[in-house]
Interface confidence: medium
């Protein structure tokens, strides 16, 4: 088992909103849960966009999940990752 490296980034979206993206990379096996949470509770699927779980050329995999949030509410959102029985939570950078 190779645990993922998780990285959260933010980018400007429409006025007053930002897109936050959570990327998991270099993990094996390919089964992973990656989702955004607001106040600890998972967002619905239709408010998130997922990338495919793709091989990264090193025998491991990568994927991402993104959602759009209101600027100023970043503290309320965290990226939740679960892989091979381990889990972690990652905040939005300020």
């Amino acid at each position: 088992t190779v645990p993922p490296m998780v990285n959260v980034t933010r980018s400007e979206a429409s006025e007053g909103n930002i897109t936050v993206t959570c990327r998991a990379s270099s993990f094996y096996p390919r089964n992973i849960i990656l989702t955004w949470r607001q106040d600890g509770v998972a967002l619905s699927h239709d408010t998130q966009q997922w990338g495919d779980v793709l091989p990264d050329g090193n025998g491991t995999y990568q994927t991402w999940v993104a959602t759009r949030i209101c600027r100023g509410e970043e503290q309320r959102f965290t990226c939740y990752m679960e892989h091979s029985g381990n889990h972690s939570t990652h905040p939005v950078p300020s």
């Epitope: 967002l43 408010t47 965290t78």
Partner: antibody, heavy 122, light 112 residues
Framework: QGQMQQSGAELVKPGASVKLSCKTS????????ISWLKQKPGQSLEWIAW????????SYNQKFTAKAQLTVDTSSSTAYMQFSSLTTEDSAIYYC???????????????WGQGTLVTVSA | DVLMTQTPLSLPVSLGDQASLSCRSS???????????LEWYLQKPGQSPKLLIY???NRFSGVPDRFSGSGSGTDFTLKISRVEAEDLGVYYC?????????FGGGTKVEIK
Amino acid sequence: QGQMQQSGAELVKPGASVKLSCKTSGFTFSDNYISWLKQKPGQSLEWIAWIYAGTGGTSYNQKFTAKAQLTVDTSSSTAYMQFSSLTTEDSAIYYCARHDYYGTSGAWFAYWGQGTLVTVSA
Amino acid sequence: DVLMTQTPLSLPVSLGDQASLSCRSSQNIVHINGNTYLEWYLQKPGQSPKLLIYKVSNRFSGVPDRFSGSGSGTDFTLKISRVEAEDLGVYYCFQGSHVPWTFGGGTKVEIK
């Protein structure tokens, strides 16, 4: 389900600050969201803020953003709330409570501390 | 803020009676993930509140089946099918769907 043990009663003077503690045991501290709540005598409850023990991330009720500061010490599995510039309006029982997002997929205040009475008086 | 209004303020009951408590929110309390985070708590004198019901109708672990929750949108109800002495106290409804999370003013269930 674990335990949440809060610090003892406090008698403080107006304008002072107080730091309340909530020591936890019996569960993985860093996995949990912990909220603080206020209850004035004979009244209902108010949610102050939560802190995620794993990252220290917080979310505050705007009413308390200038009043409360939440922190955690993962080495001792303890959550803290510092309340500043106290007035008699801050006299209340303050509770810490643990969220249960895992076992029940969304119960807010599943487990509570016993409360700390804060009295603000000159 | 979402205002949670509970009625009645006081509910005198006889042991063994059914009790019905009402909670109304000032706006729809469906979370953006589609769930309705409406909860009921019981607080007995001198004690911390205890969670009874979460997500409108789910009993928390250890809560007797005489407690049931129902409702949707803005109107919610807690029913106690046969009131026992240990059920006396103040019941609070709570919404966790919109920040700031808010409680109702409470309904005191007491002996008639």
